[in-house]
Structures are given as C-alpha cells and as structure tokens.
C-alpha cells in the first residue's frame, strides 16, 4: 500500500482543516489508514483522524482543530497499521479556505432596490471575522448568459443593487462566497443560492 | 467556580524533600495539561514543570531536571510535583497553573500558591 | 535557549495616560507563543492576553497585544488606577516556556 498523491489540507480556520490524498489503489480508508495530528506545541498530543473514502482510491480526513493561530504548525502522520505511509506538517495560517456564507436573504420591499444581506460565518473573535470580502453571483433562470458578479469589498455582508439592472418580471437566483486577503485564502464555497421574482415599476418614458 | 488549591510547601532543610500537591476543583483535570510555576522572593515568574493531559509527556526546566519529579491523578483531580534534593535556591512560592490548549500556552488559571522555605 | 529581556525595567506613567510595554525575543519564535499576564502585590498572576494578541476571558478592551518574530507588546490605551502592577510576558514554544522579567507599571 503506498500514498500516489501527497496529503494536501485546508484550514476554516476556526475548527476544522481537511485533508486529502489518493492510495495506489481502491482502499478502505476508514479501515485501513489513520491520519494522526499533533500541534507543535510543549505538552500537546496526538489526535487521529479516521479518513473517509472520496472515490475508490481517495481518502479525506476532517482534523478537529480547538482554535487557530497564526503560528500553529501540525506534524502529520499517515499510517496503515503499523506502517508509517508519509510524514508531513501543516501550517493551517498557510493553507485557508474560508467557511461559506450563510443565511442569504434578497429583500425587495424596498422601493425600486434589492437588498441582498448574508452572515458572516465566522464569530467575532475570530481573525477572520473583520477581514473577509464577499462576491455576490446573480444568474437568471431563464437566460444563461445574464450571469453576473458583484465583489463587495467592504466588510458590511450586504450589497444593494437596483431592481433596474436586472430585467423584470422574471426569477433570479443568488449565492455568495468569501474571501480574506490578509492570508491570501482560497475562496469558500458558494453559499445555498436564493430565488426571487424580480418586479419593478418601469419608469414612464418621456415624450 | 473553577479553582486550584495547592498544599504541601513548608521549611525543608537543603537536600531534603518535600512533596506539593493541587486540588482542582471546577473543571475535570484530564482535559488540561498543567504546570507548575515559581517565584523567589521579591523576583519574577520561573516556569518549573509542566505534564501532558494523559501523563504521556513531561518537561522541566534545567534548574530542576533530575531533582523533580512532576505527576498527576486525573481521578482524583489532583496535580503533584515531588521535590527532592532541594536547594536554597528552589525557595519560592510555587504556583500550579492550567493550560488550555485554545489560549495557546496561556495560563488561564492559577491557584494561590504554596511556600517552599530551603534553610538550615 | 530563549531569553525575554522586557523593557523598560519600571514604568512610570499617570491614570488616563497609554502605556506601552516591551518584550523581546533573543530568537525568532514563528511556531510559539507569546502571552501577557498581570501580576499585583500577593496575588497570583492573571492571564491578559495570549497567541499575542487574544484578549484572554473578562480582560477590557485597553488592552490589547501585538507583535511578531521577535518584537512584541503590550499597550493600555487609557491607564486606570487598578492597571498598576507588574506586567510579564510569557513565551510558550514547542520545547521550552519562558517568562521575561517583568516591568513594573508605577503611578506618576
């Protein structure tokens, strides 16, 4: 049994990093390996892992993590009984994917704008909370090509738009994801997008 | 109200022994490594000893390696540090501390203290 | 081994004023971790801040941690009466703690 392709791990950075890697072959990998992780820290332990498998030959570990800081560091061992696969480590501060956004909610009873609003996903103690930026998708239904992004650089998780820039009397859908500059992460998932009829009133033409 | 209560500090000749214990109380023990923390009279903070939560591993610093022996009983909520060989120099109030491993080596509870006096 | 001079020795400052203490490594500690603790006349120590600039439970916002490699500090924005005491900086690393020596934060 041998490891074809690396462990490679992202980090919420709030509780949990995730591991992936592919064996040689099919693999149990609940029953056959054990991802162990040990802070780099006086005192600390082991934890293990029991991966789950992600396609015949792939293995993904979910590492519950208690808080993290910008200079924690993880030895990493993959081990099939007792033999050691690989030995690795694992800076989570290095390696983000930021949680995705929740709760998105388009609110058109404003006069004539939408207002899109979403929760940051982190708590306010986290790093991340005040450092994460958002792009807001907004596709329609009906049309492919009326896809379009908006980023929100600005920390507030809302984005006000014109119900005029989209067209009228049909359904849009919306989704959100995020990322943080300040450790250059990778972006979140998209959210669970939301449906909406857009309406508005044209404005009357002038002759 | 989580707390930790050492005992056992005294007047010990040097080369004698003296055995320190810590009650916790409030929180289960296991959960947390802990250390043991001095300070001489009148002078600053001096780390002294630390255990992992399951007893797998222990540190010390050099003053005392070889002389102290630290411990614990997770049943009983309790932390040791068995002092021999003692040294006018090892007289200080000694301090069981908790670590939790969120506040990254902070020591977030501390117990009132215990008098060691090393003097003929 | 890492030693923690803290500077200055004793600081001398008045209520309301912002006090800004020092502590600085002999190494750099990337993969350690740098905590505060207040200690005041026959008391044990109390935790301020840890991972150098976390504010541990119930500390007030005047306080506040920062720094890295091998700089760190400790600031009080706005001194009250209460924040007078010795002030330690603690580095917790992969094999050894450390504890600097101490400022003492006097009234004026």
């Known amino acids: 049994m041998k490891v074809l392709q690396e462990p490679t791990c992202v980090s919420d950075y709030m509780s949990i990093s995730t591991c992936e890697w592919k064996m040689n072959g099919p693999t149990n990998c609940s029953t056959e390996l054990r991802l162990l992780y040990q802070l780099v820290f006086l005192l600390s332990e082991a934890h293990t892992c029991i991966p789950e498998n992600n396609g015949g030959a792939g293995c993904v570990c979910h590492l519950l993590m208690d808080d993290v800081v910008s200079a924690d560091n993880y030895t990493l061992d993959l081990w099939a009984g007792q033999q050691l696969l690989w030995k690795g480590s694992f800076k989570p501060s290095e390696h983000v994917k930021p949680r995705a956004p929740g709760n998105l909610t388009v609110h058109t009873n404003v006069s004539d704008t939408l207002l899109l609003t979403w929760s940051n996903p982190y708590p306010p103690d986290n790093y991340l909370y005040n450092h994460l930026t958002y792009a807001v998708n907004i596709w329609s239904e009906n049309d492919p090509a009326d896809f379009r992004i908006y980023n929100v650089t600005y920390l507030e998780p809302s984005l006000r738009i014109a119900a005029s820039t989209l067209k009228s009397g049909i359904s849009y859908r919306a989704r959100v994801r995020a990322w943080a500059q300040c450790y250059n992460t990778t972006w979140s998932e998209w959210s669970p997008s939301t449906k909406w009829h857009n309406s508005y009133r044209e404005p009357f033409e002038q002759h | 109200e989580v707390q930790l209560l050492e005992s056992g500090g005294g007047l010990v000749q040097p080369g004698g022994s003296l055995r320190l214990s810590c009650a916790a109380s409030?929180?289960?023990?296991?959960?947390?490594?802990m250390h043991w923390v001095r300070q001489a009279p009148g002078k600053g903070l001096e780390y002294v000893s630390g255990?992992?939560?399951?007893?797998?591993?222990?540190y010390y610093a050099n003053s005392v390696k070889g002389r102290f022996t630290i411990s614990r009983d997770n049943p009983k909520n309790t932390l040791f540090l068995q002092m021999s060989s003692l040294r006018a120099e090892d007289t200080a109030v000694y301090y069981c501390?908790?670590?939790?491993?969120?506040?990254?080596?902070?020591?977030?509870?501390w117990g009132q203290g215990t008098t060691v006096t090393v003097s003929s | 081994e890492i030693v923690l001079p803290q500077s200055p020795g004793t600081l001398s400052l008045s209520p309301g004023e912002r006090a800004t203490l020092s502590c600085r490594a002999s190494?750099?500690?990337?993969?350690?971790?740098l905590a505060w603790y207040q200690q005041k006349p026959g008391q044990a120590p109390r935790l301020l801040i840890y991972?150098?600039?976390r504010r541990a439970t119930g500390i007030p916002d005047r306080f506040s941690g920062s720094g890295s490699g091998t700089d760190f500090t400790l600031t009080i924005s706005r001194l009250e009466p209460e924040d007078f005491a010795v002030y330690y900086c603690?580095?917790?690393?992969?094999?050894?703690?450390?504890f600097g020596q101490g400022t003492k934060l006097e009234i004026k």
């Open positions: 501390v908790r670590v939790k491993v969120r506040y990254r080596g902070g020591m977030d509870v």
């Open positions: 409030g929180f289960t023990l296991s959960s947390y490594a």
């Open positions: 255990i992992s939560y399951s007893s797998a591993s222990t």
């Open positions: 190494q750099g500690v990337s993969s350690a971790y």
């Open positions: 991972g150098t600039s």
């Open positions: 603690q580095l917790y690393g992969s094999t050894s703690v450390t």
